[in-house]
């Protein structure tokens, strides 16, 4: 029951956090946490990389033409997020929710 509740909250909150708070002034801790999550779990977006299309930051000029954050890249270099290609984006690897679910299941046993 606890796992199910945690799982539901993760699903509801992660995409909301990514779309509304990522790279917004005053939310540097959130940005850093999302970057770390994507890099360490080899994932991109909440469900998949296309989730980033809804991000206020990605949609603005501040993103500099990126379609995903640079932290979605397998090899991170500045502006690597401009090309949403599976060769350097955690695209086929799935979203971060799936990766987090697996991690939580393994550590709650």
């Amino acid at each position: 029951a606890y796992y199910q509740q945690l799982n539901t909250e993760l699903k509801e909150n992660l995409k909301d956090t990514m779309t509304k708070r990522y790279h917004q002034p005053g939310h540097e801790a959130v940005t850093s946490a999302v970057d770390q999550l994507q890099q360490e779990f080899h994932c991109c977006g909440s469900n998949n990389s296309q989730d980033w299309r809804d991000s206020e930051w990605i949609r603005s000029q501040e993103a500099g033409g990126r379609v995903v954050p640079d932290s979605c890249c397998k090899t991170v270099v500045a502006l690597c997020g401009q090309r949403d290609h599976a060769s350097n984006i955690y695209k086929v690897e799935g979203g971060c929710i799936t990766k987090l679910e697996t991690f939580i299941q393994e550590h709650l046993r």
């Epitope: 603005s60 000029q61 033409g65 500045a78």
Partner: antibody, heavy 118, light 111 residues
Framework: EVKLVESGGGLVQPGGSLKLSCAAS????????MSWVRQTPEKRLEWVAY????????YYPDTVKGRFTISRDNARNTLYLQMNSLKSEDTAMYYC???????????WGQGTLVTVSA | DIVLSQSPASLALSLGQRATISCRAS??????????MHWYQQKPGQPPKLLIY???NVESGVPARFSGSGSGTDFSLNIHPVEEDDLAIYFC?????????FGGGTKLEIK
Amino acid sequence: EVKLVESGGGLVQPGGSLKLSCAASGFTFSTYTMSWVRQTPEKRLEWVAYISSGGGTTYYPDTVKGRFTISRDNARNTLYLQMNSLKSEDTAMYYCATPRIGTGFAYWGQGTLVTVSA
Amino acid sequence: DIVLSQSPASLALSLGQRATISCRASASVEYYGTSLMHWYQQKPGQPPKLLIYEASNVESGVPARFSGSGSGTDFSLNIHPVEEDDLAIYFCQQSRKAPYTFGGGTKLEIK
């Protein structure tokens, strides 16, 4: 050509209110983050308000938090700054500004002067 | 808040000389390989003008005489050769962490 035109400045007494406007043209306003930056008579620059492209996120430094409110009307291509409980230290030239890409402010208006004095 | 310390506060140079303005941040302004430090020029009666963004990228329309360098906490703006038109105040600004802050400015005068 990108154009930002501020208006609404003037002389106001301490404790008073003022609403600044910034009319934008020459770019897709609704996809641009916007900021207000002020410059004191001593030429010091201070970033005083930020609003995300869709208006969902705002940010204020502690010096103005609770007194200033930034808003935008994407249909009218206009940015606003509502300033309440004004203090003498709020006396400055107020500029609206936005980055071209990234976070360096490439586009600035000519500014509107706000003087808070009894 | 990240404090930006600019030096010198003022600089008087002859035409053709090199101007070097320094900006030191109280914390790193690096983000995923990008230095979120920018440089502006402000002439009397005008708003600031972006010269350099992200430490070393020259903004469109800015003469090649202007260059920026640095990373982490230490940055510099170079102008070479200095021309009459460069008489202005120069500011650095960081956008790594809110509130975004500006340096105190460096006034460049021509001898």
